[in-house]
Interface confidence: medium
Amino acid sequence: PGPPPGPPRVSPDPRAELDSTVLLTRSLLADTRQLAAQLRDKFPADGDHNLDSLPTLAMSAGALGALQLPGVLTRLRADLLSYLRHVQWLRRAGGSSLKTLEPELGTLQARLDRLLRRLQLLMSRLALPQPPPDPPAPPLAPPSSAWGGIRAAHAILGGLHLTLDWAVRGLLLLKTRL
């Protein structure tokens, strides 16, 4: 006779799956906070910084009541993909001033990539509809000056921090509804 059948496949506990995603998101939130503080120390921000290519904010107090897991994960993944692209761009085109943020910026990129893979895995484990492949995004124009790169870094890290902050709260809330 052939080899004995393997143990029955246990379907993953969605709350535990979500828990580990929350932990990763919290960890990335802390990393982003530290890097944003480092950037502020080295290059103090004068006022607010915006970048039109960044995703618009997806969550707020009012949106929490209507949150649904598929929508949150899909939107979060799309937004984080955009931030990953912006971090990559920052490392490549941000100028010599931003080299002082290495290796932390590289670590942030790697952890962001890891969270994205974790979200993808969570969506497949929970049998959520997979989003269509992302259309190729138009290339980001290089900053017009060294100061432009620094302003962009403030906008990217600030936006990522805010997105992750809301993501933690939203994921914690969704966990209670599973």
Epitope: R26, G47, L57, H161, L162, W166, L173
Partner: antibody, heavy 117, light 110 residues
Framework: EVQLLESGGGLVQPGGSLRLSCAAS????????MNWLRQAPGKGLEWVGV????????FYADFVKGRFTISRDNSKNTLYLQMNSLRAEDTAVYYC??????????WGQGTLVTVSS | QSVLTQPPSASGTPGQRVTISCSGS????????VNWYQQLPGTAPKLLIY???LLPSGVPDRFSGSKSGTSASLAISGLRSEDEADYYC???????????FGGGTKLTVL
């Protein structure tokens, strides 16, 4: 540097009205939900309410529902608290605070509202 | 009467470790993030701990937070005289659809 500066506090009679303002600077105001909180003299902190970043949603504590209204003008980077039908127990220092998620990461210095005849 | 329960006072000597507790229910601490605020005499509150145990920029790592079930705690190690302040725990409450606070704990450094 993030700054929140409240104004508009003062002495008002019971049943009267007052409008508080909170001028924000140093961050993209239109990206953040904003809150009002208060602290009666010698007492603890009390949350009054929150308005979403785009003003589409508002939540209030039960004790102010129907009497207080939170609004914002993103073009002026300003948050408001309209207080009507004021009572003696509304006497407190009122703070505005920014919310990036579940917490208040920056607070103003506060403005004192005294309700007394 | 506050929704979250904290001891009204706590004390310690310089260098000591002190812990402040905060208890709630499943609708607040059990299901939501706990945040801690420090209020020095005569000043506005300041965020000390968020999402149960994360430290904002500029807060020394002598401060730490933890949560288990429907209770949370704030620990301060290597106590200093400048830590003398009121400390408040806070969380969103699902049933009230709002933010709730503990009554505050007055910390005295002896």
């Amino acid at each position: 540097e993030v700054q929140l500066l409240e104004s508009g506090g003062g002495l008002v009679q019971p049943g009267g009205s007052l409008r508080l303002s909170c001028a924000a600077s140093g961050f993209t105001f239109s990206h953040y939900d904003m809150n009002w909180l208060r602290q009666a003299p010698g007492k603890g902190l009390e949350w009054v309410g929150v308005i979403s970043y785009d003003a589409s949603n508002k939540f209030y504590a039960d004790f102010v529902k129907g009497r207080f209204t939170i609004s914002r003008d993103n073009s002026k980077n300003t948050l408001y608290l309209q207080m009507n039908s004021l009572r003696a127990e509304d006497t407190a220092v009122y703070y505005c605070a920014r919310t990036p998620g579940s917490h208040f990461d920056y607070w103003g210095q506060g403005t004192l509202v005294t309700v007394s005849s | 009467q506050s929704v979250l329960t904290q001891p009204p006072s706590a004390s310690g000597t310089p260098g000591q470790r002190v812990t402040i507790s905060c208890s709630g229910s499943s609708s607040n601490i059990g299901n939501n993030a706990v945040n801690w605020y420090q209020q020095l005499p005569g000043t506005a509150p300041k965020l000390l701990i968020y999402y149960d145990d994360l430290l904002p920029s500029g807060v020394p790592d002598r401060f730490s937070g933890s949560k288990s079930g429907t209770s949370a705690s704030l620990a301060i190690s290597g106590l200093r005289s400048e830590d003398e302040a009121d400390y408040y725990c806070s969380a969103w409450d699902d049933s009230l659809s709002g933010v709730v606070f503990g009554g505050g704990t007055k910390l005295t450094v002896l």
